[in-house]
């Protein structure tokens, strides 16, 4: 029977900068029941606080609700593991909520085949940012990525759309049914999950174009 091994805080995520959750990985348990506590202070403060909510994020987690979340302030946190034989501490983790946002996927992805009379046909898609993200304040810049593939293909073709919420693709296989998805990430932060797939049938008379793609 031994003191617990050193835990590690390995992940923190926020859906929208208003709340966030951090997760830790326990070290060895030393063969005894082990209690974990997360303590933190905000940069510039000496007062230590204990995790406000160990439940919401699931096992080995700490959730910070709205009243505990401040932007532009670094949180310095650590996890203490204790059993009857002693204690061990994780390394301190420095967290700035601005940098740990993982948004929901973009919404309302619509995909259409456009066949203008005077130009080559193209695939046109547009989408909306996730609802929880407030882009009007200027605190967020969202970047988008699109992927698509013929229904039976194994490989995805990926395109970076920058900050645009619409995109054109000019080179596709006629007669194929395509799956299209979009995801987003803040300029500092993490990619969202991919949006649900949207299916589009490319007409058999779709003319292949030498130029690959461009965005508005």
């Amino acid at each position: 029977q031994l003191p617990p091994g050193k835990p590690e805080i390995f992940k923190c995520r926020s859906p929208n900068k208003e709340t966030f959750t951090c997760w830790w990985r326990p070290g060895t348990d030393g063969g005894l029941p082990t209690n974990y506590s997360l303590t933190y202070h905000r940069e510039g403060e000496t007062l230590m606080h204990e995790c406000p909510d160990y439940i919401t994020g699931g096992p080995n987690s700490c959730h910070f609700g709205k009243q505990y979340t401040s932007m532009w302030r670094t949180y310095v946190m650590m996890v203490n593991a204790t059993n009857q034989m002693g204690s061990s501490f994780s390394d301190e983790l420095y967290v700035d909520v601005t940098y740990i946002v993982q948004p929901d996927p973009p919404l309302e992805l619509t995909v259409e085949v456009k066949q203008p009379e005077d130009r080559k046909p193209y695939l046109w898609m547009k989408w909306s940012p996730p609802t929880l993200i407030d882009l009007k304040t200027g605190w967020f810049t969202l970047l988008y990525e699109i992927r698509l593939k013929p229904e039976k293909a194994a490989e995805w073709e990926t395109h970076f759309a920058g900050q645009q919420t619409e995109f054109k693709i000019l080179s596709l296989h006629p007669g194929q049914k395509y799956l299209v998805q979009v995801r987003c990430k803040p300029d500092h932060g993490y990619w969202s999950a991919w949006s649900p797939a949207t299916f589009i049938q490319i007409p058999s008379d779709f003319i292949m174009n030498d130029h690959h793609h461009h965005h508005h």
Epitope: F10, R25, T74, Y94, D96, Y190, W191
Partner: antibody, heavy 120, light 107 residues
Framework: EVQLVQSGAEVKKPGSSVKVSCKAS????????MHWVRQAPGQGLEWIGE????????NYNQKFKDRATLTVDKSTSTAYMELSSLRSEDTAVYYC?????????????WGQGTLVTVSS | DIQMTQSPSSVSASVGDRVTITCKAS??????VAWYQQKPGKSPKLLIY???NRYTGVPSRFSDSGSGTDFTLTISSLQPEDFATYFC?????????FGGGTKVEIK
Amino acid sequence: EVQLVQSGAEVKKPGSSVKVSCKASGYTFTTYWMHWVRQAPGQGLEWIGEIDPSDSYSNYNQKFKDRATLTVDKSTSTAYMELSSLRSEDTAVYYCARNGGLGPAWFSYWGQGTLVTVSS
Amino acid sequence: DIQMTQSPSSVSASVGDRVTITCKASQYVGTAVAWYQQKPGKSPKLLIYSASNRYTGVPSRFSDSGSGTDFTLTISSLQPEDFATYFCQQYSSYPWTFGGGTKVEIK
């Protein structure tokens, strides 16, 4: 204990490429951004770029955008920096440096440095 | 790019002296400044982040004041292990940039 162990010194010809590795241990590799910084002999520090090992998303100093490539191998917790079209001015010690936290780009852990000498 | 201008480029001082190093940013950087110490043949070591926060384990004799464009690193009572080169760094906007360094030498 957090450690960043870099590959050994390299001597390269002008016009060639070099690939420097940085093996991380003592923490979860995908948690923190990894940065590359260089220091020419007797000079200051110059930031080359950064990569998020969780998804390989990277940002570069425009000065190096066309010549530097940052990659990671999550299976071995190793970051790489490749610099192409080498010239004598690229002679420097190249450092990998781990982001200090989940936040802005200050660097709490540094590799021991890899000296790259470019000479004909 | 934001230029970080450090002064002086070198300073001679004795053990126990108070040493100040300044760093001036060419544009507003808020408090997005870090300071590093580097000894010959070694990697830099983080001292201060966010302009005024000492990193874990850094002695209290190191402090920073300033925000916006002007920053000062102060070593309140110089110790033998403090003779080294000091760099400031801004992380307000890409590309992250460093000052040219200040060498603190033994008088």
